[in-house]
């Protein structure tokens, strides 16, 4: 194919893949008609002037997870059609000036991975065509104003992965085709107000795992087509008032791993497009009367993990479209009996690991179609008459771990139980944990009279059989987080987003027999 | 362009085990959901359960619960499921797709992964 | 588990002509917001492609002649002037509880 080096292989598409260790410089001749040029995995540690200089019909070049440490400043000359130059992973600390001059086609640079400390507006400044800029994973400390201002057409850039301590709100102001901004995984501690003013277009803005502690209210106000915005795992301490008003078309928030100690009415929305909001992992204590109220179409709502000891019973108004609830590791002790009134289409609550003494006897009154309730850990001694009766869809019902007393009102829970057994799951039953003589019996099978013999037990309506089915639990399994090296690891440059850290299988959703979509 | 490339076919002998990958590309893995869905020949759809890579959860079809099992290596974007203790009526077509939120339709799906089970 | 049954099994209709395509649910599977219905097209030897998601709601880059339509537990796939490209099965399917499918409708051209 018009002389393919030994060292390669080349294709009748005119594709031509270099890879081994054996490679220590660019190989020759390369043929005249290649448009596509892989130099992989080998141990190239310089690339010298002009070693592409015959094949001026490249469109796409790779040279990656090399040894590559130096580029002369002519290295890419007379690659007038080169659309794709990725450089990603290697050894690079310094680009040398003038590097891209001539690539007049370049849409997409790809130089993550390296160990670049710095750029220079001079560097990107004939990338007028350019599109993606991938940064990610380098050294950088700062970006200089003007880096990227002549990057007009830029539509992705990925800084994320670097030692970023602060932005200047002007790097940012010439990009308004930019539709991805990546700034994970930095240093910043703050941004400055109008950074994002400029990029009107903008649909992803990654800020996640930060040291950000405040956001300015105004910092979204200008980025009415924002999607997708992530600001997990920082430091934020609270959220200014109308700083996620102007989000309409917003449909993932992360807010997780951040230190929120308060949420304000309305903070969130209008968000009509928002199906699924994650706060695990704060420091909120308490939930106002109509947080979440412009979040008509959440599905999803995750509050595990926080300190929540009180929740107004108008904390959940407007949610009702909410399939999933997660209020588990908290510290509440009392329920107010309309709290989940509104939640006509409840399917999964999770209460587990608690502090709840009792529960009303109307706390489910109107989310008739829960299938999954996750009561175990908690304080509770007993359950008031009926509180299931209603949930003929209810498939799973956790109740262990709490200091049930046994005595003579506990009857009309347990002949409940007794004819609802396949719900309680096999795995843990709940048993008794006062009086005494009966401490660690199972609480379906123990006999109350022998529990409490000097207690005359009057004849009690027993919780009514509802329907349940022989192979029931029959939906899906639900485990949080799987304890596996690959889950519980940082996800690496290319995911842009980072896994939690955790191995407690039911730290996060919190479910274990719970239905899905 | 978003692609979901799931590996080749597979024939095994029943009792043994298999494990099918889904390899993610131009989007974020992390941020959506993958379903795996079973047909078998000639027949219609079956949804066996769903990974959500941000956390590693999972759901599953009970009736999948021991047969499957589905995992994720965000290092790599690539989801896996693995059946084990395979049986004649195990052979299917086993897609991967994604779903942006939980009760989302698929939007993208792999182009399948064909398990044959015979002795 | 939810039961959706499709119906016809199968379907002939004229180029140009209306296919219409009816889903029962065993159940509902709306709210007073949204239908938790989709529907799919399979063509043979290829993946399920989406075409519609929450009953109604064209998805991205899917013709117009296809639309969607029904809550609680009555559906309707339209086809409003069907191509040759569109011979294909196309199945619902509910994320109400656990995911069910369908069991096909297959059309052809007459």
């Known amino acids: 194919y018009h002389g393919c080096p030994s060292e390669c292989t080349c294709s009748r598409a005119s594709q031509v893949e270099c890879t081994g260790a054996r490679i220590v410089a660019v190989p020759t001749p390369l043929p005249w008609n290649a448009m596509s040029l892989q130099i992989l995995n080998t141990h190239i540690t310089e690339l010298n002037e002009s070693p592409f200089l015959n094949i001026s019909a490249l469109i796409a070049l790779r040279i990656e997870k090399n040894e590559l440490s130096r580029i002369t400043p002519g290295a890419f000359r007379n690659l007038g059609s080169l659309r794709y130059l990725s450089l990603a992973n290697n050894k690079l600390q310094v680009l040398p000036i003038g590097l891209f001059q001539g690539l007049d086609s370049l849409e997409s640079l790809l130089l993550s991975s390296n160990q670049l400390l710095q750029i220079q507006p001079a560097h990107f400044s004939q990338c007028s065509n350019l599109k993606e800029l991938q940064l990610h994973g380098n050294h950088l400390e700062y970006i200089p104003d003007g880096a990227f201002d002549h990057l007009v057409g830029l539509t992705k850039l990925n800084l994320g992965k670097n030692s970023l301590t602060h932005i200047s709100p002007r790097v940012f102001q010439h990009l308004g085709n930019l539709q991805v901004l990546r700034l994970y995984e930095n240093r910043l501690t703050d941004i400055p107000m109008g950074t994002f003013d400029g990029l009107v277009n903008l649909q992803e803005l990654a800020l996640q795992q930060n040291q950000i502690g405040l956001l300015s209210p105004g910092l979204f106000h200008n980025n009415h087509n924002l999607q997708r915005l992530y600001l997990s795992n920082n430091h934020i301490s609270q959220l200014p008032p109308s700083v996620f008003m102007q989000l309409p078309q917003l449909n993932r928030l992360t807010l997780f791993g951040n230190s929120l100690k308060e949420l304000s009415p309305g903070i969130f929305g209008p968000m009509p497009n928002l199906r699924e909001l994650w706060l695990y992992d704060n420091h909120i204590s308490s939930l106002p009367d109509n947080v979440f109220s412009n979040l008509r179409q959440l599905q999803v709502l995750i509050l595990s993990r926080n300190q929540i000891s009180f929740i107004s019973p108008g904390a959940f108004n407007g949610l009702t479209e909410l399939r999933e609830l997660s209020l588990h590791t908290n510290a509440l002790q009392d329920l107010d009996g309309n709290v989940f009134r509104m939640l006509a289409n409840l399917q999964n609550i999770s209460l587990q690991n608690n502090r709840l003494r009792q529960l009303p006897g109307n706390i489910f009154a109107n989310v008739n179609g829960l299938m999954a309730i996750q009561l175990q850990n908690n304080q509770l001694e007993n359950l008031p008459l009926g509180i299931f009766d209603h949930l003929g869809k209810l498939c799973e019902l956790r109740l262990y771990d709490n200091p049930w007393r046994c005595d003579s009102d506990i009857l009309p829970l347990r002949n409940w139980l007794l004819l609802n057994q396949p719900r309680l799951g096999t795995d843990t039953v709940p048993v008794c944990f006062s009086p005494a003589n009966v401490r660690g019996q199972s609480l379906i099978i123990i006999n109350v009279n022998v529990a409490v013999p000097s207690v005359h037990v009057p004849e009690v309506p027993s919780y009514p059989e509802t329907p349940w089915y022989p192979d029931t639990p029959s939906y899906p399994d639900t485990t949080s987080v799987s304890s596996t090296t690959e889950l519980t690891s940082p996800v690496e440059d290319y995911t842009d987003l980072t896994t939690i850290q955790v191995t407690d299988d039911r730290s996060v959703w919190g479910m274990t027999q719970a239905q899905s979509g | 362009e978003v692609q979901l490339v799931q590996s080749g076919a597979e024939v095994k002998k029943p009792g043994s085990s298999v494990k099918v990958s889904c390899k993610a590309s131009g989007f974020t893995f992390t941020d959506y959901y993958i379903h795996w869905v079973k047909q078998a020949p000639g027949q219609g759809l079956e949804w066996i359960g769903l990974?959500?890579?941000?956390?590693?959860?999972?759901n599953y079809n009970q009736k999948f619960k021991g047969k499957a099992t589905l995992t994720v290596d965000t290092s790599t974007t690539t989801a896996y499921m693995e059946m084990s203790s395979l049986r004649s009526e195990d052979t299917a077509v086993y897609y991967c797709?994604?779903?942006?939120?939980?009760?989302?339709?698929?939007?993208?799906w792999g182009q399948g992964t064909t398990v044959t089970v015979s002795s | 588990d939810i039961v959706l049954t499709q119906s016809p099994d199968s379907l002939a209709v004229s180029l140009g002509e209306r296919a219409t395509i009816n889903c029962r649910a065993s159940q509902s599977v709306s709210t007073s917001s949204y239908s938790y219905m989709a529907w799919y097209q399979q063509k043979p030897g290829q993946p399920p492609k989406l075409l519609i998601k929450y009953a109604s709601s064209l998805e991205s880059g899917v013709p117009d002649r296809f639309s969607g339509s029904g809550s609680g537990t009555d559906f309707t796939l339209t086809i409003s002037s069907l191509q040759a490209e569109d011979v294909a099965v196309y199945y619902c399917?509910?994320?109400?509880?656990?995911?069910?499918f369908g069991g096909g409708t297959k059309v052809e051209i007459k």
């Open positions: 399917e509910q994320s109400w509880e656990i995911r069910t």
């Open positions: 797709a994604r779903g942006d939120n939980k009760y989302d339709a698929m939007d993208y």
């Open positions: 990974v959500y890579p941000y956390i590693g959860g999972t």
